[in-house]
């Protein structure tokens, strides 16, 4: 038994036929010693007397609000809730399994940007006697604060004969660092109580993995002379992180009629305009995704082809916002070849995802995972890799990136990747290895040697352990190179001479 909140207790029960249940001792919160009686819920039947009451809790009939009285006066209450465990698994009767992205997904969370603000939602078919409370933190062993509001009913839907209720909650990380590479996941815990049943649900994620931008805004069409083609332009959504030269998006543009079976024109672009073929009765749709990290695509923003072309052409915000004049030279060091670094770091992003695209969809977090991921270098909040830090002195950040590149390059050349099951030299991992080396050499200033970090002794003995470790390393590398690519894209747009 444990206290959920003041005067509310949760009794954990192994739930099987003829289970012995749990013996619970309730104590009346009063200085009185004599003449105390106990009742359950609305019943006036006296269950016992004395300052304490011992009960055997086996089923829901034994749960409820226990009240101690003296001479018709209520002294205190204790509400007992039951948490069922069947075959070693805690019950999940209150919430509906959303089955996306995998089975046993009860909580789903999304973030519109990297500000540390996110929304979680869940579904239930229960309409009454239902309460939720939500707690969140970053990391579990040394948790950092995340503040969540109250869960509210956000939607009702009819599914066949049933009504389905969607609840949602908004949370905000207290000291968010949008430009940093997350090393500890956000933990979300939802306590659900239906009548006398208690259940808890958890979700663990990095903000980068739950990013889903809002749709692009201000779609405009401009027909091209003497052509079937139309120039479509758009802008970054207002809710996306800034500056856009750092937090860049990539876009998918599609022309299609209402029916999904219809033929279509489709093109991908990093710009904020594209030229497509518009057909009568079709619509042009545009959606966005983080350019350097393969999280979710936004919903589509659409405009009908038949709509009159706006007079405004051009390419919107260009994905390289940040504006302002070119910035001064980096103090205390030479500037890197920003554009070359940008191209190579973008290639690294692509390779990191193609080295194993499934890595992105495998849930590799497990016990002790915080230790494993802490063995690799992360671009942290104080490393100066945010736009302002780069403006002040990019050397701190570049040194950190260089250390990381060397570290991962050594890791990809180590027994973890060279041992069984073997990988060929020109596999995506081999290409990744070579590109990490290439970028680190571009960064290393002449006659200047930055200190590098030692590789931890991670090498496992079993091939299956090696495979799991590869997945984890590639997963971390995907996050690391995404931050590096943002740094170089921003540098190329605002710092290069």
């Amino acid at each position: 038994i444990w206290e959920l909140k003041k005067d509310v207790y949760v009794v954990e029960l192994d739930w099987y036929p003829d289970a012995p249940g749990e013996m619970v001792v309730l104590t009346c919160d009063t200085p009185e010693e004599d003449g105390i009686t106990w009742t359950l819920d609305q019943s006036s039947e006296v269950l016992g007397s004395g300052k304490t009451l011992t009960i055997q809790v086996k089923e829901f009939g034994d749960a409820g609000q226990y009240t101690c009285h003296k001479g018709g006066e209520v002294l205190s209450h204790s509400l007992l809730l039951l948490h069922k465990k069947e075959d070693g698994i805690w019950s999940t009767d209150i919430l509906k399994d959303q089955k996306e992205p995998k089975n046993k997904t009860f909580l789903r969370c999304e973030a519109k940007n990297y500000s540390g603000r996110f929304t979680c939602w869940w579904l239930t078919t229960i309409s009454t006697d239902l309460t939720f409370s939500v707690k969140s933190s970053r990391g579990s062993s040394d948790p950092q604060g995340v503040t969540c509001g109250a869960a509210t009913l956000s939607a009702e839907r009819v599914r066949g004969d049933n009504k389905e209720y969607e609840y949602s909650v908004e949370c905000q990380e207290d000291s968010a660092c949008p430009a940093a590479e997350e090393s500890l996941p956000i933990e979300v815990m939802v306590d659900a109580v239906h009548k006398l049943k208690y259940e808890n649900y958890t979700s663990s994620f990095f903000i980068r993995d739950i990013i889903k931008p809002d749709p692009p805004k201000n779609l405009q069409l401009k027909p091209l002379k003497n052509s079937r083609q139309v120039e479509v332009s758009w802008e970054y959504p207002d809710t996306w992180s800034t500056p856009h030269s750092y937090f860049s998006l990539t876009f998918c543009v599609q022309v299609q009629a209402k029916s999904k079976r219809e033929k279509k024109d489709r093109v991908f672009t990093d710009k904020t305009s594209a030229t497509v073929i518009c057909r009568k009765n079709a619509s042009i749709s545009v959606r966005a995704q983080d350019r350097y990290y393969s999280s979710s695509w936004s919903e589509w923003a659409s405009v009908p082809c038949s709509g009159s072309g706006s007079s405004r052409g051009g390419s919107g915000s260009g994905g390289s916002g940040g504006g302002g004049s070119k910035l001064r030279a980096v103090p205390g060091g030479s500037s890197p070849a920003w554009t070359q670094c940008q191209q190579l770091s973008q290639k690294l992003c692509t390779l990191a995802w193609s080295a194993h695209p499934l890595v992105g969809h495998m849930d590799l977090r497990e016990e002790g995972d915080e230790e494993t991921t802490n063995d690799v270098p992360h671009i942290q909040c104080g490393d100066g890799c945010d736009p302002q830090g780069l403006r002040d002195n990019s050397q701190f950040c570049l040194q950190r990136i260089h250390q990381g590149l060397i570290f991962y390059e050594k890791l990809l050349g180590s027994d973890i990747f060279t041992g069984e099951p073997s990988l060929l030299p020109d596999s995506p991992v081999g290409q990744l290895h070579a590109s990490l080396l290439g970028l680190s050499q571009l960064l290393q200033p002449e006659g200047h040697h930055w200190e590098t970090q030692q590789i931890p002794s991670l090498s496992p003995s079993q091939p299956w352990q090696r495979l799991l470790l590869r997945f984890k390393i590639l997963r971390s590398l995907q996050a690391f190179v995404a931050v590096a690519a943002r740094v170089f894209a921003h540098g190329a747009a605002t710092l290069s001479p």
Epitope: R261, K263, K264, V267, T269, K280
Partner: antibody, heavy 118, light 107 residues
Framework: QVQLVQSGAEVKKPGASVKVSCKAS????????LHWVRQAPGQGLEWMGW????????EYAPKFQGRVTMTTDTSTSTAYMELRSLRSDDTAVYYC???????????WGQGTMVTVSS | EIVMTQSPATLSVSPGERATLSCRAS??????LHWYQQKPGQAPRLLIY???QSISGIPARFSGSGSGTEFTLTISSLQSEDFAVYYC?????????FGGGTKVEIK
Amino acid sequence: QVQLVQSGAEVKKPGASVKVSCKASGYTFTDYYLHWVRQAPGQGLEWMGWIDPENGDTEYAPKFQGRVTMTTDTSTSTAYMELRSLRSDDTAVYYCNANKELRYFDVWGQGTMVTVSS
Amino acid sequence: EIVMTQSPATLSVSPGERATLSCRASQSISINLHWYQQKPGQAPRLLIYFASQSISGIPARFSGSGSGTEFTLTISSLQSEDFAVYYCQQSNSFPLTFGGGTKVEIK
């Protein structure tokens, strides 16, 4: 399944015209874009243009603009590509292909060899 | 127009070995890049679309990667039926253009 059957080989004199046909089956003709791509002997692939059988819209590669005409006959599910003012360097295998997506080529015809020789 | 350059022109590989084919665009084309295989006397066949998307019915040994200007087609373990000419094609803008092809031959 989706199938494209093209007309037989042709031999033409320089300055003449050729009209190659491409009969589609296994799908609703107006549901796919139709492209024409050619390949000179021992050479690579060269895109010529596309037609939307639903409305007759076309887009031609600048190189063939004014010399090529693509048409369709929805009653027979057939596409046609006419190339005029033939030169010896137009000697090639001409392929039609179909796709629901406009910009790449999923289903290909078997090809029609057009030889331009005096 | 966008010029597509493939390398090498010819690649000699032994059966069972891995083959890596490169394709470079004259300007950034995001992931608007597709790969085809052509055997002698046959029409080309689509292998990969949008740089890395696999086609049902195409063996899993064919994979694509890349974005921007550099792209790679990888055949993880060459089978006898894989010896052919491979073409890349950009769809970023009209006119659609192909690379000159890479001939994969038996070593």
